[in-house]
């Protein structure tokens, strides 16, 4: 049999070998495609199938506009002028070239030694699905799962049957000061079909700088809290990737799992003291925040407020 590749929406003519070019002809076309469940023999007189597959006067079969459901096998059996039976067999596959792929949400720059999302390559409207590949400085990037990570997603349109492909590239550049060029290409995997390439993006790789300051936020403001209240300490740091955060109380590390938030519920006097957080960045040493003081007091330092509950538990008014 012969393999035929046809573009979706385009006409396709399959010739019936051995068939006389003009009637009278003895021929039979049958097909097994997404429109059939088994073999469908086409009527030489024509009929409802003519909109998808029509026998022409010369015995050829015309598919006016090939679709995904027309993929399959087409066979013609003809008797030539000498009375010999001649068979033609075609395996038809269809394709659709998508629009030019695009890199969406590209990074503005990259930071050395840490994972960076380069961007997401998107291709819309392909059939079959095809593949997306990333290139670095013109060379194919092979994802290794460590320095080069690719996250892929394929979706199929419920009505058209065409595919949308997405590929998200994350890299860990080894050194700063370079200007790598990334591009993405789509390939259908069909012979004689060149890949479609995105416009390249050139990114600057900077060395990871020290975190731009570290702040310790306290809630309630001022760090004064009544017994049984809750204190929330938040270590705010503008570093990427987020560093590990440990906590210190009165100069001693607290035996807690690293976390940028320290929650002190139902505080008592034993929770009073000076707190700070220490951020440890992979490429830099530890950085400590300015300290904050936590004080546990009934109603502050001014003495009982007017209308407060006295020792007797009764409300008193001055």
């Amino acid at each position: 049999g012969q393999n035929i590749t046809a573009r979706i929406g385009e006409p396709l003519v399959l010739s019936c070998k051995g068939a006389p070019k003009k009637p009278p002809q003895q021929l039979e076309w049958k097909l097994n495609t997404g429109r059939t469940e088994a073999w469908k023999v086409l009527s030489p007189q024509g009929g409802p199938w003519d909109s998808v597959a029509r026998i022409l006067p010369n015995g050829s079969l015309l598919l006016p506009a090939t679709g995904i459901v027309d993929e399959g096998t087409f066979r013609c059996r003809a008797t030539n002028r000498r009375g010999k039976e001649v068979k033609s067999n075609y395996r038809v596959r269809v394709y659709q070239i998508p629009g030019k792929p695009e890199i969406v949400d590209p990074a503005s720059e990259l930071t050395a030694s840490v994972p960076n999302k380069v961007g997401t390559c998107v291709s819309e409207g392909s059939y079959p699905a095809g593949t997306l590949s990333w290139h670095l400085d013109g060379k194919l990037l092979i994802p290794d799962g460590k320095e080069t990570l690719v996250k892929e997603e394929t979706r199929r349109h419920p009505e058209t049957g065409l595919f949308t492909l997405r590929s998200e590239l994350t890299v860990i550049p080894t050194q700063g000061g370079t200007h790598p060029t990334f591009s993405c290409s789509f390939s259908l995997g069909l012979p004689r079909r060149r890949p479609l390439n995105t416009a390249p993006i050139q990114l600057r790789v900077r060395e990871p700088g020290p975190p731009e300051g570290i702040q310790l936020l306290v809630e309630p403001e001022g760090g004064i809290v009544a017994p049984g209240g809750t204190v929330t300490l938040t270590c705010a740091i503008s570093a990427q990737p987020p560093p590990q955060v440990h906590w210190i109380k009165d100069g001693a590390p607290l035996p807690l799992a690293p976390s940028p938030v320290l929650l002190l519920p139902e505080v008592g006097h034993e929770d009073e003291g000076t707190y700070s957080c220490v951020a440890t960045h992979p490429s830099h040493g530890p950085q400590e925040s300015p300290p904050v003081s936590i004080r546990v007091t009934e109603t502050g330092d001014e003495g009982p407020a007017e209308g407060s509950v006295g020792e007797s538990g009764l409300g008193t008014l001055a």
């Epitope: 429109r35 469940e37 088994a38 409802p48 199938w49 003519d50 909109s51 998808v52």
Partner: antibody, heavy 119, light 107 residues
Amino acid sequence: EVQLVESGGGLVQPGGSLRLSCAASGFTFNNYWMTWVRQAPGKGLEWVASIDNSGDNTYYPDSVKDRFTISRDNAKNSLYLQMNSLRAEDTAVYYCARGGDITNGFDYWGQGTLVTVSS
Amino acid sequence: DIQMTQSPSSLSASVGDRVTITCRASQDVGFYVNWFQQKPGKAPRRLIYRATNLADGVPSRFSGSRSGTDFTLTISSLQPEDFATYYCLEFDEHPLTFGGGTKVEIK
């Protein structure tokens, strides 16, 4: 909204002629095959003629072949049925329907026009 | 030519009943069968296309099924507005053939 409106029905003598029209709106007319279906009084539905979207190919059952001609004018979004040599058994309500090929059969129908063949 | 033998030709049923109408094709027509509903003095309305697919705007109590050359229209719970005549149509081969119709009447 898809609309099909038939016209041209009436009383005609046996052996006479009549031309039915169907005005289509609400869809891209030249993307669809079109069909005429009839229904004799108190009887079932019978396929009369179909035409492909370009108008190049027409199809008929033996009962009307060589007497009826289906045609279309895509510029006017109109479908026609020229009926010649009419017989008493052609008396029916004639419906215009969208479709007729394997992609969807018939999905929309007009309200019908009555043709009465009687002396 | 293909024959579409529809049965029963008429039936009496009550509101809420489950109703089944069958068409048998004299030869293989694939899934190229439609079902229509027709009320007196009105044009047919498509209910089911390609044997099993519910047409737009048709209530889900209507369903179509197929077993070889046997096609079935089922109304799961008959409603007052469902009393009408139902037709099947094969559109796999010319001449296109309708079933003889099934009139669903109130018991």
